[in-house]
Amino acid sequence: VSITKCNSDMNGYCLHGQCIYLVDMSQNYCRCEVGYTGVRCEHFYL
């Protein structure tokens, strides 16, 4: 799978994680920090 950094316009899209662009899937994806979930890593779980 080809991966690159998201465009600058997506800075701040992932609240608690890193935005990566999955080239083959044409999708932005939030790689969440430990303890966070959700499309934008917006939910905290214990």
Partner: antibody, heavy 116, light 106 residues
Amino acid sequence: QDQLVQSGAEVKNPGASVKVSCKASGFNIKDTYIQWVRQAPGQGLEWMGRIDPLRRQTKYREKFEGRVTITADTSTNTAYMELSSLRSEDTAVYYCVRSGREFDFWGQGTLVTVSS
Amino acid sequence: DIQMTQSPSSLSASVGDRVTITCRASQDIHKYIAWYQQKPGQAPRLLIQYTSTLQPGVPSRFSGSGSGTDYTFTISSLQPEDIATYYCLQYEQLRTFGGGTKVEIK
């Protein structure tokens, strides 16, 4: 399936304001950014601004700053674009556009006519 | 703001011709460019995103290339149904459309 349904055509007098709505279904606007783009008759496409409904953060094109207000109501899954101090040059089709995880998905457009 | 300079603004070509449209960004947009087709009275239709990724259902005669600040959109063999206006869009930093290219048949 995912949809963006915009409000109907409007006719406004010069100097008035217009508020166009964009209701999302099939997805949560909090997972996206909502952009607004307009196109005057016979002219090109022009990006106006966008909102991040989750953070309630807006960014506007400089030329519209102070005249456009983009808002979102996450309880009804609806975004809004209000343009004030209307002039004849604002006659255009206004589109809302979803961006975020996937690339852009457009609403059907709303024609706003400014005429006295 | 990033500026997008699209050229030519209009062109006339014969059916079967190769058609090329260029967009130049005022700074590096890291391949974050899309190409739209718009026919009169219709909303824009996305053809290509991320420089060269063709959307599902878009004919393979459409292609895109480029990097840095210079990008190209190509129709390898112009068809009558390709008569439209084409726009580039940079989405690296916010969004900026090119001025459009009206494609007509000779």
